[in-house]
Interface confidence: medium
């Protein structure tokens, strides 16, 4: 057993057919020694009396808010969790697999840019009684400090019969530097409790490996003379790192008709412009890498041709 | 400061070119030892990430952008540094600084030249000849190292007697390469970096 | 001991909003877990739930009649009150309030009272 | 929603005799499922929770079990007081959703 915040106390389980479960001591938080008894969940029904409540937890039957009381007036609480173990495995029942890029991806994370500012996000088709607690660090043995907000609700998607929730939360690294080559890994950990349930989640990075550029800005079509040329150009995302000639990006130009079917023409280039074909109802995106660094390319930036 | 990106113009300055064949010749190693060392640990997620040149080089310091010089966090471990009186540099000064940087640079591909040669005289002799370090990738070392145009002492390569560890050594490379792209990637950034300066 | 009793009028008239009151005793809801479920079931049929509130003012209603549903909550008079505009015909039915603990299951419930939806 | 399909509507048994009653979520719930007993002109009143935890003072003849969409009540050897509607009710997701009920009779 152990706390995870103020009397709030996770007690971690074998899950099989007839274990035997943990023997938990609930000391009651007060000077009195006498005439205490033990409720479960604001039930009227006495567990026990005395200081110290000792219980056989099994299963979440045997959870939840235990009070301890002296003549009618409530003394203290001490709620415990249950942390299932199965095979060996901690249970994972309350995050979805969001099997991208691998199988057993519960968190996803992704950067904007080298400024140590980084956002998670899961998925879980739990949409009350939940709650998320987010830590993270740079290393794990000798931690150096990283900031976490509050998890919150950004999107709910229906997948089919289901409807799922995605919650998101925005982390900054404390002391990072741009440019800094990354040795040790970010670490981000995340404490789930659904009901009387405590699940936790890990996910470990370099920040290098999740950069993830916003799409080009002002994107602008300028029609050549006598030509069915245009020249396409566009400008390094507000959110990209800087100075951009060392934080450089490479552009991919796309040119695709109105069917999806329709062939593709599509030139990179290092340069905030190019020259392009632009067909009848076709249209014109532009997504952005890191030059040098080959991680995520950003979503488009488009435009049509007319 | 959003300077244009120039095209590589080897005579405005040859190392951008070089330095950006480096890049090219160690990822695409570091891929062909991913592939063939399937079975050993070579991700980035698998491997320690340890820096042969750490203590002995100081590259992302000698080599920061002026822009990053008034981040804190960048300056922690700086001996050097390039802020002046009122952050003004004088020419004398920015020429000084970028020779830091190019001979940190010039230092650290000396150090992974002598451990990959080491490392590829143990994988000739294993009796899987299962990889094999490419040439291609010591020559574009060479090139650029030649392109800096600093003149130092050639460091003999180590010689062991020793009948070497060959699952060690593979993972060695994997370590070695996974830190020597990295150090590619800041190599690379600070060549485009002066070349737009 | 713990009892919830649910209050309001009997007969209302189409249209009309219907207001109605839990009270409860032997828990608060001023402590956390706890929370308070409003839940009906016309004449002969299963039970639907309509909208639940919690210890900290977090509210969920039954997305089907979320627009004519507002549930909310005296701490001090250990209250909570359901109200349900444009009533019609087909939402007479026993109406039930009931507490829901952290074991997230409905352990106690009022007796019900009984709306009709009639002109 | 969370649609609970619960089967049979209705039951004719003897006493003594063993009931099984069955619920099936569109979705998986977890053991987010509760069992509900309301005897004629009375409210509801919890059985099991957690799809298989017997509520204080439940008789150890009723039993649930089940995880994900699958689950099952049983009361074991039944008596003339067990004559009553029973509900399943899933509360993994809101809007939390009832089972049709299963209508007990004894003969």
């Known amino acids: 057993i152990w706390e995870l915040k103020k009397d709030v106390y996770v007690v971690e389980l074998d899950w099989y057919p007839d274990a035997p479960g943990e023997m938990v001591v609930l000391t009651c938080d007060t000077p009195e020694e006498d005439g205490i008894t033990w409720t479960l969940d604001q039930s009227s029904e006495v567990l026990g009396s005395g200081k110290t409540l000792t219980i056989q937890v099994k299963e979440f039957g045997d959870a939840g808010q235990y009070t301890c009381h002296k003549g009618g007036e409530v003394l203290s609480h001490s709620l415990l969790l249950l942390h299932k173990k199965e095979d060996g495995i901690w249970s994972t029942d309350i995050l979805k697999d969001q099997k991208e890029p691998k199988n057993k991806t519960f968190l996803r994370c992704e950067a904007k840019n080298y400024s140590g500012r980084f956002t998670c996000w899961w998925l879980t088709t739990i949409s009350t009684d939940l709650t998320f607690s987010v830590k993270s660090s740079r290393g794990s043995s000798d931690p150096q400090g990283v900031t976490c907000g509050a998890a919150t609700l950004s999107a709910e998607r229906v997948r089919g019969d289901n409807k799922e929730y995605e919650y998101s939360v925005e982390c900054q690294e404390d002391s990072a530097c741009p440019a800094a080559e990354e040795s040790l890994p970010i670490e981000v950990m995340v404490d789930a409790v659904h009901k009387l349930k405590y699940e936790n989640y890990t996910s470990s990075f370099f920040i290098r490996d999740i950069i993830k550029p916003d799409p080009p800005k002002n994107l602008q079509l300028k029609p050549l003379k006598n030509s069915r040329q245009v020249e396409v150009s566009w400008e390094y995302p507000d959110t990209w790192s800087t100075p951009h000639s060392y934080f450089s990006l490479t552009f991919c130009v796309q040119v695709q008709g109105k069917s999806k079917r329709e062939k593709k023409d599509r030139v990179f280039t290092d340069k905030t412009s190019a020259t392009v074909i632009c067909r009848k109802n076709a249209s014109i995106s532009v997504r952005a890498q890191d030059r040098y660094y080959s991680s995520s390319w950003s979503e488009w930036a488009s435009v049509p041709c007319s | 400061r959003n300077l244009p990106v120039a095209t590589p113009d080897p005579g405005m300055f040859p190392c951008l070119h070089h330095s950006q064949n480096l890049l090219r010749a160690v990822s695409n190693m570091l891929q062909k030892a991913r592939q063939t060392l399937e079975f050993y640990p070579c991700t980035s997620e698998e491997i320690d990430h340890e820096d042969i040149t750490k203590d002995k080089t100081s590259t992302v310091e000698a080599c920061l952008p002026l822009e990053l010089t008034k981040n804190e966090s960048c300056l922690n471990s700086r001996e050097t540094s390039f802020i002046t009186n009122g952050s003004c540099l004088a020419s004398r000064k920015t020429s000084f600084m970028m020779a830091l940087c190019l001979s940190s640079i010039y230092e650290d591909l000396k150090m992974y030249q002598v451990e990959f040669k080491t490392m590829n005289a143990k994988l000739l002799m294993d009796p899987k000849r299962q990889i094999f370090l490419d040439q291609n990738m010591l020559a574009v070392i060479d090139e650029l190292m030649q392109a800096l145009n600093f003149n130092s002492e050639t460091v003999p390569q180590k010689s062991s007697l020793e009948e070497p560890d060959f699952y060690k050594t593979k993972i060695k490379l994997c370590i070695l390469l996974h830190a020597f792209r990295i150090r590619a990637v800041t190599i690379d950034r600070v060549m485009s970096y002066l070349n737009a300066s | 001991e713990v009892t919830l009793r649910e209050s309001g009028p009997a007969l209302v008239k189409p249209t009309q909003t219907l207001t109605l009151t839990c009270t409860f005793s032997g828990f608060s809801l001023s402590k956390s877990v706890m929370g308070v479920s409003w839940i009906r079931q016309p004449p002969g049929k299963a039970l639907e739930w309509l909208a639940h509130?919690?210890?900290?003012?977090?509210?969920y209603y039954n997305p089907s009649l979320k627009s004519r549903l507002t549930i909310s909550k005296d701490t001090s008079k250990n209250q909570v009150v359901l109200t349900m505009t444009n009533m019609d015909p087909v939402d007479t039915a026993t109406y039930y309030c009931?507490?829901?603990?952290?074991?997230?299951?409905?352990?106690?419930w009022g007796q019900g009272t009984t709306v009709t939806v009639s002109s | 929603s969370v649609v609970m399909t619960q089967t049979p509507k209705f039951l004719l048994v003897s006493a003594g005799d063993r009931v099984t009653i069955t619920c099936k979520a569109s979705?998986?719930?977890?053991?987010?499922v509760a069992w509900y007993q309301q005897k004629p002109g009375q409210s509801p009143k919890l059985l099991i929770y957690y799809a298989s935890n017997r509520y204080t003072g439940v008789p150890d003849r009723f039993t649930g079990s089940g995880y994900g969409t699958d689950f099952t009540f049983i009361i074991s050897t039944v008596r003339a007081e067990d004559l009553a509607v029973y509900f399943c009710q899933q509360d993994y997701n809101s809007p939390w959703t009832f089972g049709g009920g299963t209508k007990l009779e004894i003969k």
């Open positions: 509130i919690y210890w900290d003012d977090d509210k």
């Open positions: 979705q998986s719930v977890s053991n987010d």
């Open positions: 009931a507490r829901r603990g952290i074991r997230s299951a409905m352990d106690y």
